[in-house]
């Protein structure tokens, strides 16, 4: 873990101010894989290379984030830089020989729950928010909190509102949200788990 992130940061830090601006504009229109959301324009345009790297990794995870960055660089005519990024990402990431178990690709920060670990990606990518709310209502969410989340206009704003309540939750409350995510958007949990 971290190799792809470092390679993305390296590439973005080597862009001129004008190139970085162009990169961000292209990122707003680049085709995305199904299930991935777009980084909001307002937040994106004000970011420096470091913030943008963090945002790319939290939205798209390391592997796809690096691939997407390379695609945008290629689209900008920066083929050599795109090639270097992909080479750095793939270096040392070959498959384990048959019969040998590769260790998990990453270890989450100890003591950090899955939903805290993947907060940004969950805000961006959870679509079935109403289902989550129904699953959590009465167990984790009060009626007032339930209504406050439902009142938000978009899925990301609903999730952001839901996350505003999580600092008061204990581990088991967070587990109930994770369980609801497993049941409603299992593919997303799998995807984040691989990151």
């Amino acid at each position: 873990m971290g190799r792809a992130r470092d390679a993305i940061l390296d590439a973005l830090e080597n862009l001129t101010a004008e190139e970085l601006k162009k990169f961000k504009l292209k990122l707003l229109s680049v085709p995305l894989r199904e299930g991935y959301g777009r980084i909001p324009r307002g937040a994106l345009l004000s970011m420096d290379a470091l913030d943008l790297t963090d945002k790319l990794v939290s939205f798209y995870l390391e592997t796809y984030g690096a691939e997407l960055t390379a695609n945008v660089l290629r689209d900008m005519g920066l083929q050599e830089m795109a090639g270097q990024l992909q080479a750095a990402t793939h270096q040392g990431s070959g498959a384990a020989p048959a019969g040998i178990q590769a260790p998990p690709q990453s270890a989450a920060k100890p003591g950090l729950h899955f939903i805290d670990q993947h907060r940004a990606a969950l805000i961006a990518r959870v679509t079935n928010v109403e289902w989550l709310l129904d699953a959590l209502y009465g167990k984790v969410l009060t009626d007032e909190q339930y209504q406050a989340v439902r009142a938000e206009p978009t899925n990301p704003s609903k999730m952001r509102k839901l996350f505003s309540f999580t600092p008061a939750w204990n581990w088991t409350c967070k587990d109930l949200l994770l369980q609801a995510l497993r049941e409603s958007q299992s593919y997303l949990v799998e995807d984040l788990e691989r990151s």
């Epitope: 369980q179 497993r182 049941e183």
Partner: antibody
Framework: EVQLVQSGAEVKKPGESLKISCKIS????????IHWMHQMPGKGLEWIGY????????MYNEKFRGQATLSADKSISTAYLQWSSLKASDTAMYFC???????????????WGQGTLVTVSS | DIQMTQSPSTLSASVGDRVTITCHAS??????LSWYQRKPGKAPKLLIY???NLHTGVPSRFSGSGSGTEFTLTISSLQPDDFATYYC?????????FGQGTKLEIK
């Protein structure tokens, strides 16, 4: 090396109280959930619940809620399972276990204690 | 609660045989299933997690597959050390539940 060492076998009478322990070493105790399972003679494994020592919160199988209590002592990296009033049906082998890792896949139990046999008989 | 049903309950086989144990979930559990091996007087040992991932140190003759409600554990060529009881476990939702076990015995 991750190790979970459980307390020894117990023979008790119905109505008595009991607290069995699971001493953890090899990782930071407060970073992971500790789960408890039991196996009654001739039966399959059953999940009792878990405790998260980081904040002391516990999740129970509803079947065991009110029957047994999970706790943890951070100062000595030890998790406990206790009963205030044992029944003959509590006779079983009890295991503590730690998940493979602490985030989404904490449902897979890679590390187990050796088991504590509890016999309740008059 | 999600019920896990294993079949067969007992399986007689010989060293070198290919054996398959199945596990049926009473509702969709996606890929959130693991397999354990248990020998008398010992703690269970994790073999497979998330349906098909081989746990570190487990011989490659063990493999897992399936998603949704139907899962299988396959041992490609039985070794003397493999005679034991095998359990599946779902991790989709609480309470976590195990199958009743499949006892693999020498024919």
């Amino acid at each position: 090396e991750v190790q979970l060492v459980q307390s020894g076998a117990e023979v008790k009478k119905p109505g008595e109280s009991l607290k069995i322990s699971c001493k953890i070493s090899g990782y930071t105790f407060t970073d992971q959930t500790i789960h408890w399972m039991h196996q009654m003679p001739g039966k399959g494994l059953e999940w009792i619940g878990y405790i998260y020592p980081g904040d002391g919160s516990a999740m129970y199988n509803e079947k065991f809620r009110g029957q047994a209590t999970l706790s943890a002592d951070k100062s000595i990296s030890t998790a406990y399972l206790q009963w205030s009033s044992l029944k003959a049906s509590d006779t079983a082998m009890y295991f503590c276990a730690r998940p493979l890792y602490s985030y989404a896949s904490y449902y897979w139990f890679a590390y187990w204690g050796q088991g504590t046999l509890v016999t309740v008989s008059s | 609660d999600i019920q896990m049903t294993q079949s067969p309950s007992t399986l007689s086989a010989s060293v070198g045989d290919r054996v398959t144990i199945t596990c049926h979930a009473s509702q969709n559990i996606n890929v959130w299933l693991s397999w354990y091996q248990r020998k008398p007087g010992k703690a269970p040992k994790l073999l497979i997690y998330k349906s098909s991932n081989l746990h570190t140190g487990v011989p490659s003759r063990f493999s897992g597959s399936g998603s949704g409600t139907e899962f299988t554990l396959t041992i490609s060529s039985l070794q003397p050390d493999d005679f034991a009881t095998y359990y599946c476990q779902q991790g989709q939702s609480y309470p976590l539940t195990f199958g009743q076990g499949t006892k693999l015995e020498i024919k």
